[in-house]
């Protein structure tokens, strides 16, 4: 997996006037970071893992870049012209990869009212956008004002690509997200379903990075993918991930099944606990 | 005593079909998982089909994957491989397998039949 | 799909010899991986699963080592009784056997 830093902007408009707050999210390496979302910005750090990787200082850098991107975007959403009566959002993506050949990657992307309208890949410089003509009429719109601003815009729009890649280097200084593996807690627990069945969920906790695998084995033999049900991968606050699959056995074969982990190399096998059905919620309607 | 009969097998023509079954006896048979493995004269096993106790997980093999079809009665006790489209390849001495239900199994099959031969003929 | 290579394909030893056969995965299947027993036509029979857990019944002579990808099945005294074809099987990504080795009398 390579190392990389996403910006998340978003600005809204009501009625055709730009609104003065945004949000910016961003997220390092997959885990949410830093954050800020009031009218005047100060960068959080998402949980102890951000405050860690940023060290003992103040936020003021972060503080200052992401208002004036935050700034920066209000005025490419001003300049879009078919600002129809309600509300209205304008949102930038910016992403910089750093890879294990140090080749690096970096584009952005820009959405309208969530669709997708224009993309540049930041080291070739080249323009994508799709086939839609109110996409076509969005990007010319957005590119035209670009070119134009340019120079006043230069906080945001200048040598993007470097200031990313120049901000995850210094992130990855610190140590704390390089190439770090963090096992998973690993835990079964069982629900009652239905008539003699009962539903068997195994969660995965605390782990990094954020590939897993997680599957029910019955007698050592995986379940076919239709009879499990999985949640996504999604990230616990703690710069580690979470994830759960479940299925549905007949009761009193309990011991035939086993939950099946795999990550980062490291694989165990996690039996349904026996004794009393706990009476749970359960993931299957 | 824990036991698997194969029965069914015999002489087809080429593109011709055949069922075999299995007759399981001595265990409580709609808890286990159960294969079928066959294996040409000289040479060596090969697995071609997985069904779960549940029939709610099946698997084939790429060799056999849209001709053969498996199934099970767990009523009758039995084990079931519909082969159609039939070829000189698919000669063989046939085997129905149980899955071990030991823990820490890794999928190992504990019980088998004696076989069932097959013979497509052309 | 998991290959599964044995080697060597076919050996001869004595009553009493050490006999080892590998057993090698295409890819990591961790322990997953079995290892059985045919005798010239007979079905064949479970010897050890788990790559290192010995089935019940199965004499204390035969062992199994090995984890990932490169497996062992180790017969520390070769009995009369122990001449004939070896197989390893995996479970890790659907099933597959091993081409066999074949064990006779030098």
């Known amino acids: 997996e390579p190392h990389s830093l996403r910006y998340n902007l978003t600005v809204l408009s009501w009625d055709g006037s730009v609104q003065s707050g945004f949000l910016t999210e961003v997220h390092l390496d997959g885990q949410p970071f830093l954050r800020c979302d009031r009218q005047k910005c100060r960068a959080k750090p998402q949980g102890q893992w951000a405050e860690d990787v940023l060290g003992n200082k103040t936020w003021d850098r972060e503080t200052r870049d992401l208002t004036g991107n935050g700034k920066d975007l209000r005025m490419t959403l001003a300049h879009i012209k078919d600002q129809k009566e309600g509300l209205h959002s304008l949102q930038e993506i910016r992403v910089c990869e750093i890879h294990e050949d140090n080749s690096t990657r970096s584009s952005q992307h820009f959405y309208y009212d969530g669709e997708l309208f224009l993309s540049q890949n930041l080291e070739t410089k080249e323009w994508t956008m799709p086939q839609s003509s109110r996409a076509q009429t969005l990007a010319m719109n957005v590119r035209n004002f670009l070119k134009e601003d340019a120079m006043k815009t230069k906080t945001h729009y200048h040598a993007m690509h470097a200031d990313c890649l120049q901000e995850l280097r210094r992130y990855l200084k610190s140590g704390v997200v390089l190439r770090r593996t963090v096992p998973p807690m690993v835990n079964v627990t069982r629900s009652e379903a239905s008539e003699g069945n009962i539903t068997v969920t195994c969660r995965a906790s605390g782990f990094y990075p954020w590939n897993i695998t997680l599957s029910w084995r019955q007698d050592g033999v995986s379940l076919s993918h239709d009879t499990q049900q999985w949640g996504d991968v999604l990230p616990d606050g703690n710069g580690t991930y979470q994830t759960w699959v479940a299925t549905r056995i007949c009761q009193g074969e309990e011991q035939r099944f086993t939950c099946y982990m795999e990550h980062s190399g490291n694989h165990s096998t996690h039996p349904v606990p026996s004794g009393k059905v706990l009476v749970l919620q359960s993931h299957w309607q | 005593q824990v036991q698997l009969q194969e029965s069914g097998g015999g002489l087809v023509q080429l593109g011709g079909s055949m069922k075999l079954s299995c007759g399981a006896s001595g265990f409580t048979f709609s808890s286990y998982s159960m294969n079928w493995v066959r294996q040409a004269p000289g040479k060596g096993l090969e697995w071609i089909s997985y069904?779960?106790?549940?029939?709610?997980?099946?698997y084939y093999a790429d060799s056999v994957k849209g001709r053969f079809t498996i199934s099970r009665d767990n009523a009758r006790n039995s084990l079931y491989l519909q082969m159609n489209s039939l070829r000189a390849e698919d000669t063989a001495l046939y085997y129905c397998?149980?899955?071990?239900?030991?823990?820490?199994?890794?999928?190992?099959?504990?019980?088998w039949g004696q076989g069932t031969m097959v013979t497509v003929s052309s | 799909d998991i290959q599964l290579t044995q080697s060597p394909s076919s050996l001869s030893a004595s009553v009493g010899d050490r006999v080892t056969i590998t057993c090698r995965a295409s890819?990591?299947?961790?322990?997953?991986l079995n290892w059985y027993q045919q005798k010239p036509g007979k079905a064949p029979k479970l010897l050890i699963y788990a790559a290192s857990s010995l089935q019940s019944g199965v004499p204390s002579r035969f062992s199994g080592s090995g984890s990932g990808t490169d497996f062992t099945l180790t017969i520390s005294s070769l009995q009369p009784e122990d001449f004939a074809t070896y197989y390893c099987?995996?479970?890790?990504?659907?099933?597959?056997f091993g081409g066999g080795t074949k064990v006779d009398i030098k």
């Open positions: 099987q995996q479970s890790y990504s659907i099933l597959t």
């Open positions: 397998a149980r899955v071990s239900s030991v823990t820490g199994n890794t999928g190992a099959f504990d019980i």
């Open positions: 890819q990591s299947i961790h322990n997953y």
């Open positions: 069904i779960n106790s549940r029939s709610n997980t099946i």
